[in-house]
């Protein structure tokens, strides 16, 4: 510990100029003081001043007021420093002396005489408030005050706690009256060495080296470091952990740059036709009746839907069609009959029922026949019941759907995912195609299932000519060139039209 006992001398009165032995001072009592501070004693005894001692120069003659003085000789208040834990109790002896000698160093002069002395014993807590007192005897009076304060950087009830304010990386704090640390704004922790990061900064993914900062750890971004950084080059994907590229719906490939949902993104099928995806950039259009073409962009003949009934023949016209009705029928679609049951109009065992008092009829057809005269065999495939490009087949009284690869169900309405069993190795991306799954391999792997580790990229040297596209991963440790129209050869190096005997086959 470390502190200072301070004694402020205020006024000394010795009106008659007398010494303790009853003699008078000539011409007056030139007065200086000796102060002895020691540990508490119930009865003050001579001996070492264990807490310190100090003497003053001559401060006045007989009676005088002592002014405060901060430096040099005659400093007031008097300072008695100590380097130990203040015990809270003390004994103090103040002696007034007369000197005939040197004003500045009367202590060294011979012939000094005691004027008076006072002894104070008691308790005193550390604090800034002065304790004021006055002591009288028959000849003199002394007014004074005293206190104990801690030295700079020492705190607490006994000045035993060392604390130095600091503002560096071992602490950013000031000192409280009890010596505990008071962190500067923006800092926390036992030693006030931990910065308080920007409010909301992610605890794991962000950190700071100074207050109100948020530095992101690798793989994270954003003001609060709560957004992951996706794989470099990720096009149509997101991440939930850094460097991930989880593809948005309809996209595939390592960088989610392969369009698996061409139908939705581009709507290539026209005239209300149905679009079915079939792998990256692949699709099929299923046309409504009356349309054809790759995108169902071509309108069929107006007669294509067989609008003429009862054996009427159809003839295309500019924006319409015309039905030529057989004998006994009339109407736009030959739907009206001039026949009656007497003409036996019902075929295939259909039974005739008269209507409108015998002026018309209706045929009740046996199973598997239809038409107003039961002339048509039932085609259960006319309603296009098979979805996803399935083929409809009549089987006696029923029909079945023959599904395309990758689909199942009574109407081919269920999609079989070949990718469900994760056939692609080494992080390859799987795509369901008509002829089974296809794997898009990451760099460094090839093969139908990305199972082959390649030591170099076979396509890197650009082996395909004439603008052909190079693919690795379709055959182990090799490449395949997909030739543009008009070129053939394993590297697409030969234009079509070479002699038939030429050995290369596209």
């Amino acid at each position: 510990g470390s502190g200072i006992f301070q004694l402020r001398l205020q006024e000394f009165v010795n009106q008659r100029g007398m010494l303790a032995n009853g003699q008078s001072c000539e011409p007056g009592c030139r007065t200086f003081f000796r102060i002895c501070l020691k540990h508490f004693q119930a009865t003050f005894s001579e001996g070492p001043c264990t807490f310190g001692n100090v003497s003053t120069p001559v401060l006045g003659t007989n009676s005088f007021v002592v002014r405060d003085k901060n430096s040099g000789s005659g400093r007031n208040p008097l300072q008695l420093p100590f380097n130990f834990t203040w015990p809270g109790t003390f004994s103090l002896n103040i002696q007034a002396w007369h000197t005939p000698g040197d004003d500045l160093r009367p202590e060294t002069s011979p012939g000094n005489s005691l004027i008076s002395q006072i002894i104070i014993q008691g308790s005193l807590a550390v604090g800034k408030i002065w304790r004021t007192d006055e002591q009288n005897d028959t000849l003199t009076r002394l007014s004074y005050s005293y206190r104990v304060i801690c030295s700079d950087n020492y705190y607490g009830e006994s000045c035993s706690r060392l604390c130095k304010k600091r503002d560096d990386h071992f602490g950013h704090y000031e000192c409280q009256p009890d010596g505990s640390l008071s962190c500067l704004p923006g800092w926390t922790g036992k030693y006030c060495d931990q910065p308080i990061c920007l409010s909301g900064c992610h605890e794991q993914n962000g950190y700071c080296s100074k207050p109100d900062e948020c530095i992101c750890r690798p793989g994270w971004q954003g003001r609060l470091c709560n957004e992951c950084i996706p794989h470099n080059g990720c096009r149509h994907g997101t991440c939930s952990i850094p460097w991930q590229c989880a593809c948005d719906e309809g996209w595939g490939g390592l960088f989610c740059d392969q369009d698996l949902n061409y139908c939705t993104h581009h709507s290539p099928c026209k005239n209300g036709s149905t679009c079915s995806n079939s792998g990256p950039k692949g699709y099929t259009c299923t046309c409504l009746p009356g349309y054809t073409g790759e995108h169902c962009e071509l309108g069929l003949s107006k007669c294509a839907s067989n609008p003429c009934r009862n054996g009427g023949s159809c003839k295309d016209q500019e924006n319409s069609y015309h039905c030529l009705c057989p004998p006994g029928y009339y109407g736009q679609h030959c739907e009206h009959s001039t026949l009656t049951c007497a003409d036996s109009p019902c075929f295939n065992g259909g039974s005739c029922r008269e209507r409108n008092q015998g002026s018309s009829y209706a045929c009740e057809c046996p199973p598997n026949f239809t038409g107003s005269n039961c002339e048509k065999k039932v085609d259960r495939c006319t309603s296009n019941p098979c979805a996803n490009g399935g083929q409809c087949q009549n089987r006696g009284p029923s029909r079945t759907c023959r599904c395309r690869p990758g689909f199942t169900g009574t109407h081919c309405e269920l999609h079989i995912s070949d990718c469900a069993r994760s056939p692609c190795a080494h992080g390859g991306t799987c795509h369901d195609l008509e002829n089974g799954p296809v794997c898009t391999c990451p760099a460094g792997f090839s093969g139908r299932r990305c199972e082959v580790r390649i030591t170099h990229d076979a396509c890197a040297s650009g082996p395909c000519f004439n603008g052909a596209t190079c693919y690795t991963g379709l055959s182990p440790n090799n490449f395949v060139c997909n030739c543009p129209y008009g070129f053939v050869g394993s590297r697409c190096e030969f234009p079509v039209g070479l002699p038939p005997s030429f050995p290369w086959v596209a």
Epitope: D152, N153, L162, K164, K165, R166, D167, D168, H169, F170, G171, G189, K190, Y191, D193, Q194, Y207, S209
Partner: antibody, heavy 121, light 106 residues
Amino acid sequence: EVQLQESGPGLVKPSETLSLTCTVSGGSISSSSYYWGWIRQPPGKGLEWIGDIYYTGSTYYNPSLKSRVTISVDTSKNQFSLKLSSVTAADTAVYYCARQALAMGGGSDKWGQGTLVTVSS
Amino acid sequence: SYELTQPPSVSVSPGQTASITCSGQRLGDKYASWYQQKPGQSPVLVIYEDSKRPSGIPERFSGSNSGDTATLTISGTQPMDEADYYCQAWDRDTGVFGYGTKVTVL
């Protein structure tokens, strides 16, 4: 007990980069109670503080060396490293790594045994 | 830049008291540490935060720091105390060492 061990080449050519690693054993470099520092001592001369690092990666460098010094930490290996670029003969010294304790006001309570690095062609 | 000044050498007889000073501007407002270094060995911390001793350091080592001067005192000096002694303080975020004092036990 915590121990520190410096490692790296003892000879570096002028203008090249001096690289040293300090491996901490018997304790975690990720403790929030310590900074991890580098101090050097040219032959026959006094100690010079180079810089230090916290487990989070926060670094502090001697202004006189700042333009040439990089200190990094690898918590997974319990190591921290020093790189000093564009070295000259004046960088010849024994290089110490040390643990600087927050509880001791930044005093270095643990030191490595030191490694002599000579800069010479 | 901040500097700490030490006397190059101090001589002391066995059993006597050796005092090593370390001076720097307003050093008393900073915490001072002291290191002992024997030939061919790494430094050892003997005093931190002006006057505190790490465990294992003998009681004969004590320290004080006020004004512009920190002092390391070795009371009852022993021959094994012969070594170089360095003071150290932090100036903002930079560690600063004194030039060192060689203590010779006569």
